[in-house]
């Protein structure tokens, strides 16, 4: 079996996680993509997904999660704003390709959020932060709810520095509430 690698991010409450998931342009540009959390021994849970087919550079917001799919660059940008300690956990990007099981994009993200606001969020207030104050318009999300049994994960061994995934649910709005965010200037 392929050894799944992890990248660890240690951030403070209130900061923004800002990561990218690269994919093969030719195969997956318009495929629907999702951001999932993986809890030990459970099937991955989809927290947010792009539209189907995925639109180029079109931001989709689900609660504190913002996804942007850049087709020209084979890159899905994922941001989780205003991080909370409960957001700590293991995350992954996947590409939906029914009827096949989702295709995972390496690497997984081990997020560790600690108490204590650092003074500035991951994205500074005069750039992307002001976008989140725009009144939302919502539509229904179309995230597939299926997960193949084969995607149930055996959690990799954690180092002593890692924080285990909390049992409490992440404080997000209902996954069916999709918010359109204007493209940034």
């Amino acid at each position: 079996a392929t050894k799944l690698t992890e990248e660890k991010y240690e951030l403070k409450e209130g900061q923004t996680l800002d990561v990218k998931c690269d994919y093969t342009l030719e195969k997956f540009a318009s495929s629907q993509k999702a951001w999932q959390i993986i809890r030990d021994g459970e099937m991955p849970k989809t927290l947010a997904c792009t539209e189907r087919p995925s639109k180029n550079s079109h931001p989709v917001q689900v609660g504190r999660i913002i996804l942007e799919d850049y087709h020209d660059h084979g890159l899905l940008r994922v941001r989780m704003v205003n991080l909370q300690v409960e957001d700590s956990g293991l995350y992954q990007c996947v590409i939906y390709q029914p009827p096949k099981e989702p295709h995972m994009l390496f690497d997984r993200i081990r997020l560790v959020v600690t108490k204590g606001f650092s003074g500035t969020p991951g994205s500074n207030e005069n750039s992307t932060q002001n976008v989140y104050k725009i009144p939302p318009t919502t539509t229904k999300a179309l995230c597939p709810l299926y997960t193949s049994p084969r995607t149930v994960t055996q959690a990799p061994p954690k180092s002593t520095a890692d924080v285990s995934t909390p049992d409490s649910e992440i404080n997000l709005t209902n996954v069916t509430d999709i918010i359109r965010v204007p493209v940034f200037n």
Partner: antibody, heavy 125, light 107 residues
Framework: QVQLVQSGAEVKKPGSSVKVSCKAS????????ISWVRQAPGQGLEWMGG????????NYAQKFQGRVTITADESTSTAYMELSSLRSEDTAVYYC??????????????????WGQGTTVTVSS | DIQMTQSPTSLSASVGDRVTITCRAS??????LAWYQQKPEKAPKSLIY???SLQSGVPSRFSGSGSGTDFTLTISSLQPEDFATYYC?????????FGGGTKVEIK
């Protein structure tokens, strides 16, 4: 071979603005992260801010908030750093530096792997 | 902001010596750390990324180690061209921050 070529030295009056350019060649510009770092005479390196051209939005160090504007023009593979309300303590060498896109999720995974030659900005009355 | 503290601020060494420079982050940064070398009147040059990976073209006498908050740059056998100032830098989160630098001088 990726190269970053910066604009020439500038002498400015206090209170004025300076705009330094950084042209990239030989690599992927849009999905790189471009940072601006300055170094005052005899001092260490100080990160001012950065931009990922395809996203267009910049991040700035608190110290420069409101005084610095970082932009990028994908069509010419050029990044710009404009610093306003100049004072004598802004006299420094200003560098642009690139963090190449990686298979990793961190935009800066390879660190600042390519640097421009530096632009000397002198602020004097 | 994450503070990066480098030590020592300067050191004197001879050609062939083993040199160690340390860098401490004020909070955990996993392995998101880079090391740079800078010579007078020149732009910095990247040596190490991701705490321990050698940048392409950098001699193998340079090595990096550490994760979390404590990191080390080691030059196994100092060469004449290695006399310079070395900086660490974190890129776990914005704003990116540098250490104050360590100047390696000839004894």
């Amino acid at each position: 071979q990726v190269q970053l070529v910066q604009s020439g030295a500038e002498v400015k009056k206090p209170g004025s603005s300076v705009k330094v350019s950084c042209k990239a060649s030989g690599g992927t510009f849009s999905s790189s992260a471009i940072s601006w770092v300055r170094q005052a005479p005899g001092q260490g390196l100080e990160w001012m801010g950065g931009i990922i051209p395809i996203f267009g939005t910049a991040n700035y160090a608190q110290k420069f908030q409101g005084r610095v504007t970082i932009t990028a023009d994908e069509s010419t593979s050029t990044a710009y750093m404009e610093l306003s309300s100049l004072r004598s303590e802004d006299t420094a060498v200003y560098y642009c530096a690139r963090a190449s896109q990686s298979r990793s999720s961190n935009y800066y995974y390879y660190g600042l792997d390519v640097w421009g030659q530096g632009t000397t900005v002198t602020v004097s009355s | 902001d994450i503070q990066m503290t480098q030590s020592p601020t300067s050191l004197s060494a001879s050609v062939g010596d083993r040199v160690t420079i340390t860098c401490r982050a004020s909070q955990g940064i996993s392995s998101w750390l880079a090391w740079y070398q800078q010579k007078p009147e020149k732009a910095p040059k990247s040596l190490i990324y991701a705490a321990s990976s050698l940048q392409s073209g950098v001699p193998s006498r340079f090595s990096g180690s550490g994760s979390g908050t404590d990191f080390t740059l080691t030059i196994s056998s100092l060469q004449p061209e290695d006399f310079a100032t070395y900086y660490c830098q974190q890129y776990n989160s914005y704003p990116l921050t540098f250490g104050g630098g360590t100047k390696v001088e000839i004894k």
